[in-house]
C-alpha cells in the first residue's frame, strides 16, 4: 500500500535533480579555474543535507549554511548586476560583458537556476510529485529560502556602483515583493555602496516614454534613499542595440541614445 | 579631468564660524557622496564623515557631531563644511574626498588662534 | 570603533630595496573574499593619494611597484623596490564599517 504523501500547489522537484546539480558542479569549477579547490561530492552531500528528511515548510537559512560555506566564492564587489523580472537579457548581458556578475554567474546560483526541488519530512526521500508553491502554500520552502540567503549574501558582498536590470514592460517595474524588492535592496551595505544605478528595459519599439520617473521608480528611489544609498537612473529604450553596442562598443551608431 | 577646488586658509578666533567650500568638476556631483577628513599639523587622517549628494543626507563621525555641519549647493557642484562655536583644537587642514577616495581636494587650511 | 594599528612607525630602506609596511584590524574588514582596506601615500603639504584599493587592486596611474596583500584583519602595503621618490607617509584606512578609520601612518624614508 503506498503511504499517504503530501500534496503540494507547485510542481515537483526537477527530474534527474542530484545528477543535474552535481553535473552543473563539475561544469563551472572546470571552467572556473578559481573554484577548482570545490568537492562537487560535499557540495551536493550538503546540498541534499539543507532539505532531506525535513519538512519543505520549515526551511531555515541555517539548513543551508554547510552549503554556503562550501560555495564561498569571491566574486569582484563593484561588477555586480541585480535584475528583477528580465533575467534573460540580465544573462545575456554578462555573457557579453565578463567582467560583470549576477547571481547565477556565482557557483551556487548556477547550481539552482530555473531547478525546483523539496523533500519529505523524516523520509530520505525526495519529492518529485510536488512541491510547496510560495504564495499557496509557504514561504518558507527550500526553494525559496535558497533564493532568499543566497540573495541576501550576493547584495551583502556588493561594493561601489551596483547595477540592477528592471523590467519596463511589466506593470510594477519595481515590486517591492520581488527577490530584488524584498532581499536584495535590503541588504546592500551603505558603507560599501555608494550607488544603485537602476536600468530600465522598454519592451516596445516606440515606446520613448521616460520610465524613469515611473511611480514605482520614485518607491524604488524612496527606499534606496532611505538606506543611504545613492540613486540613479537609465531608460534602455533599445534592448537588442543596447546588447550590440556591448559587443561593439566602437560601433559609431553607439554614440547615441540607447 | 576630475578635480576638487577647495576655498583658501581661514584664520579665525576662538566662538567664530568658519565655511569651507569644495568645488567638483569634471563629474556630476550628485552622483558620488563626499567625505570630509581632519589633518591637525604634523598628524594623522581622521574621517569625519560624508553628505549624500543626492538627498543632502549627512552622516558625522562621532567626534564630529554638533559643531560640524556638511551641505550642498547642487547648482553651483559645490560642497560645504561649516565649523560652528570654533576652538583650538580645530586647527587643521580639512580636506573634501569624493567617495570612493580616489580624488581628494588640495586641502584648507583653518587656524583658530586668539 | 575599527582600529587600525600600523607598524612601524617609521621605516628606512636603502634605494632598490623593498619595503613592508603593516596595518592589523581589531575586527575583520572582509565581507565575502573582498577586503575593504585601502593604502595611502602623503607628501608633506599635499592631500593623500589612493595607492591600493580593496586590499589588492593597484589604483590607475600608480606604479606596479607598489602592491597590496592580506585578508579579515591583516594586511600589507609593498614597495618593491624602493626609489627616492617614495619618500612621504603612508597610510592604512578601513571602510568596511562607519566610522571608517585611518592607521596612525609610517614615515618612509632612505637609508
Known amino acids: 500500500v503506498p503511504r499517504w504523501r503530501q500534496q503540494w500547489s507547485g510542481p515537483g522537484t526537477t527530474k534527474r535533480f542530484p545528477e543535474t546539480v552535481l553535473a552543473r558542479c563539475v561544469k563551472y569549477t572546470e571552467i572556473h579555474p578559481e573554484m577548482r579547490h570545490v568537492d562537487c561530492q560535499s557540495v551536493w552531500d550538503a546540498f541534499k543535507g539543507a532539505f532531506i528528511s525535513k519538512h519543505p515548510c520549515n526551511i531555515t537559512e541555517e539548513d543551508y549554511q554547510p552549503l554556503m560555506k562550501l560555495g564561498t566564492q569571491t566574486v569582484p564587489c563593484n561588477k555586480i548586476l541585480l535584475w528583477s523580472r528580465i533575467k534573460d537579457l540580465a544573462h545575456q548581458f554578462t555573457q557579453v560583458q565578463r567582467d560583470m556578475f549576477t547571481l547565477e554567474d556565482t557557483l551556487l546560483g548556477y547550481l539552482a537556476d530555473d531547478l525546483t526541488w523539496c523533500g519529505e519530512f523524516n523520509t530520505s526521500k525526495i519529492n518529485y510529485q510536488s512541491c510547496p508553491d510560495w504564495r499557496k502554500d509557504c514561504s518558507n520552502n527550500p526553494v525559496s529560502v535558497f533564493w532568499k540567503t543566497v540573495s541576501r549574501r550576493f547584495a551583502e558582498a556588493a561594493c561601489d556602483v551596483v547595477h540592477v536590470m528592471l523590467n519596463g514592460s511589466r506593470s510594477k517595474i519595481f515590486d517591492k515583493n520581488s527577490t530584488f524588492g524584498s532581499v536584495e535592496v535590503h541588504n546592500l551595505q551603505p558603507e560599501k555602496v555608494q550607488t544603485l544605478e537602476a536600468w530600465v528595459i522598454h519592451g516596445g519599439r516606440e515606446d520613448s516614454r521616460d520610465l524613469c520617473q515611473d511611480p514605482t521608480i520614485k518607491e524604488l528611489e524612496s527606499i534606496i534613499s532611505k538606506r543611504n544609498i545613492q540613486f540613479s537612473c537609465k531608460n534602455i529604450y533599445r534592448p537588442d542595440k543596447f546588447l550590440q553596442c556591448v559587443k561593439n562598443p566602437e560601433d559609431s551608431s553607439c554614440t547615441s541614445e540607447i | 579631468q576630475i578635480q576638487l577646488v577647495q576655498s583658501g586658509p581661514e584664520l579665525k578666533k576662538p566662538g567664530e564660524t568658519v565655511k569651507i567650500s569644495c568645488k567638483a568638476s569634471?563629474?556630476?556631483?550628485?552622483?558620488?557622496?563626499m567625505n570630509w577628513v581632519k589633518q591637525a599639523p604634523g598628524k594623522g587622517l581622521k574621517w569625519m564623515g560624508w553628505?549624500?549628494?543626492?538627498?543632502?543626507?549627512?552622516t558625522y563621525a562621532d567626534d564630529f557631531k554638533g559643531r560640524f555641519a556638511f551641505s550642498l549647493e547642487t547648482s553651483a557642484s559645490t560642497a560645504f563644511l561649516q565649523i560652528n562655536n570654533l576652538k583650538n583644537e580645530d586647527t587643521a587642514t580639512y580636506f573634501c574626498?569624493?567617495?570612493?577616495?580616489?580624488?581628494w581636494g588640495q586641502g584648507t587650511l583653518v587656524t583658530v588662534s586668539a | 570603533n575599527i582600529v587600525l594599528t600600523q607598524s612601524p612607525a617609521s621605516l628606512a630602506v636603502s634605494l632598490g630595496q623593498r619595503a613592508t609596511i603593516s596595518c592589523r584590524a581589531s575586527?575583520?574588514?572582509?565581507?565575502?573574499?573582498?577586503?575593504?582596506m585601502n593604502w595611502f601615500q602623503q607628501k608633506p603639504g599635499q592631500p593623500p593619494k589612493l595607492l591600493i584599493y580593496?586590499?589588492?587592486n593597484l589604483e590607475s596611474g600608480i606604479p606596479a611597484r607598489f602592491s597590496g596583500s592580506g585578508s579579515r584583519t591583516e594586511f600589507t602595503l609593498t614597495i618593491d623596490p624602493v626609489e627616492a621618490d617614495d619618500v612621504a607617509t603612508y597610510y592604512c584606512?578601513?571602510?568596511?564599517?562607519?566610522?571608517?578609520?585611518f592607521g596612525s601612518g609610517t614615515k618612509l624614508e632612505i637609508k
Open positions: 584606512q578601513q571602510i568596511n564599517e562607519d566610522p571608517f578609520t
Open positions: 574626498v569624493r567617495r570612493g577616495f580616489a580624488y
Open positions: 553628505i549624500n549628494t543626492y538627498t543632502g543626507e549627512p
Open positions: 569634471g563629474y556630476t556631483l550628485t552622483s558620488y557622496g
Open positions: 580593496r586590499a589588492s
Open positions: 575586527e575583520s574588514v572582509e565581507i565575502y573574499g573582498n577586503g575593504f
